[in-house]
Amino acid sequence: GSVKVLHEPSCFSDYISTSVCQWKMDHPTNCSAELRLSYQLDFMGSENHTCVPENREDSVCVCSMPIDDAVEADVYQLDLWAGQQLLWSGSFQPSKHVKPRTPGNLTVHPNISHTWLLMWTNPYPTENHLHSELTYMVNVSNDNDPEDFKVYNVTYMGPTLRLAASTLKSGASYSARVRAWAQTYNSTWSDWSPSTTWLNYYEPWEQHL
């Protein structure tokens, strides 16, 4: 039968080494067997490269394309093929479609004056454009009470957050996760980091009296 794209490719770049495109077919498809995404940088002498997509769901395909350290001028020509049939053609400028890498190594440490110090790693090396552009969102939630959660925006440079233990329920187990975005690139949010969990053992001041 005829092969058709239901939702055309949507692509994002981590702006360092990888661009990912995702699209939906009009019926369940074996993406790696039936489809190919070709990509070519619009630059004199560039070669055509081929990405073999994988299934994310029955009819959703994903392709991860290795790219060079991106620069603003880069524009890729993308062509989606089913054998000899061209299903879709478009262009993609990584600098205009940034999805930052996920922050890593989120840890929680007890700190002075009844505070918790949350720390994580910037996912970009210092020489990358995005290293100094990231701001973060930290989500802290009570594992046993879905209503008890807080969101913190970290807009300063360091990948840290100080959290007063008194702002959390004593004796409760909390989880934190962090994600990043790059304001100057008008990026989307990164995926959330894996959660880290700790017990808030702060004793409210009233209990001392």
């Epitope: 940088l41 004199m44 560039s46 070669e47 055509n48 620069v71």
Partner: antibody, heavy 125, light 112 residues
Framework: EVQLVESGGDLVKPGGSLRLSCVAS????????MTWVRQAPGKGLQWVSL????????YYADAVKGRFTISRDNAKNTLYLQMNSLRAEDTAVYYC??????????????????WGQGTLVTVSS | DIVMTQTPLSLSVSPGETASISCRSS???????????LDWYLQKPGQSPQGLIY???KRASGVPDRFSGSGSGTDFTLRISRVEANDTGVYYC?????????FGQGTKLEIK
């Protein structure tokens, strides 16, 4: 040692055809784009054509578009320039040169880093 | 098309002095920060051209540090310090950014 050796230059009548060859050695030929540059007697350098490493993409100067065809045989480490409908103004020494490395996603640029010795093409009746 | 304009077209310099050649392009040759697709070539009498500078400022292999390139965007300069008799020839700039590639008219350097 990286080396380029051109051949095929000759005296040919206007409207005639000629095929130039450039044999490469000392580097991984298929990884690099190749370029033809020409120089009319007593004149400056003029870019003619470029082909990427796989041969999948070609570029031409307006003066030769539709008349000249650049190609390559990576198995033989050889670059070609097929010249048809030759004109007096095509008279020049033709040089082949190694251009950018196109194996990477964004070609790595080193300028025209190796040149051949040139081959003379004379178009005259 | 990008037009390349060199000045001066000829230059006479005494040994040991510094020679400067300018090259201007009709469009910016900057692809990204630090990547200016402008080269300099020398053609000695009776020889094939040879690469001197690429990407505006990087010296080709084996080129002495007396040769230096600078500039960005549309304005570039080749400087040859402590000029020697062996430096005689015609110097060309070339843009390597987009098709059609293009050379300047050439600058003939003569050593007094």
């Amino acid at each position: 040692e990286v080396q380029l050796v051109e051949s095929g230059g000759d005296l040919v009548k206007p409207g005639g055809s000629l095929r130039l060859s450039c044999v490469a050695s000392g580097f991984t030929f298929r990884d690099y784009a190749m370029t033809w540059v020409r120089q009319a007697p007593g004149k400056g350098l003029q870019w003619v054509s470029l082909i990427n490493g796989s041969g999948g993409k070609t570029y031409y100067a307006d003066a030769v578009k539709g008349r000249f065809t650049i190609s390559r045989d990576n198995a033989k480490n050889t670059l070609y320039l097929q010249m048809n409908s030759l004109r007096a103004e095509d008279t020049a020494v033709y040089y082949c040169a190694v251009d950018r490395k196109t194996k990477t996603i964004r070609p790595q640029y080193y300028g025209l880093w190796v040149w051949g010795q040139g081959t003379l093409v004379t178009v005259s009746s | 098309d990008i037009v390349m304009t060199q000045t001066p077209l000829s230059l006479s310099v005494s040994p040991g002095e510094t020679a400067s050649i300018s090259c201007r392009s009709s469009q910016s040759l900057t692809y990204s920060i630090g990547y200016n697709y402008l080269d300099w070539y020398l053609q000695k009498p009776g020889q094939s051209p040879q690469g001197l500078i690429y990407l505006g400022h990087k010296r080709a292999s084996g080129v002495p540090d007396r040769f230096s390139g600078s500039g960005s965007g549309t304005d570039f300069t080749l400087r040859i310090s402590r000029v020697e008799a062996n430096d005689t020839g015609v110097y060309y700039c070339m843009q390597g950014l987009q098709s059609p590639l293009g050379f300047g008219q050439g600058t003939k350097l003569e050593i007094k």
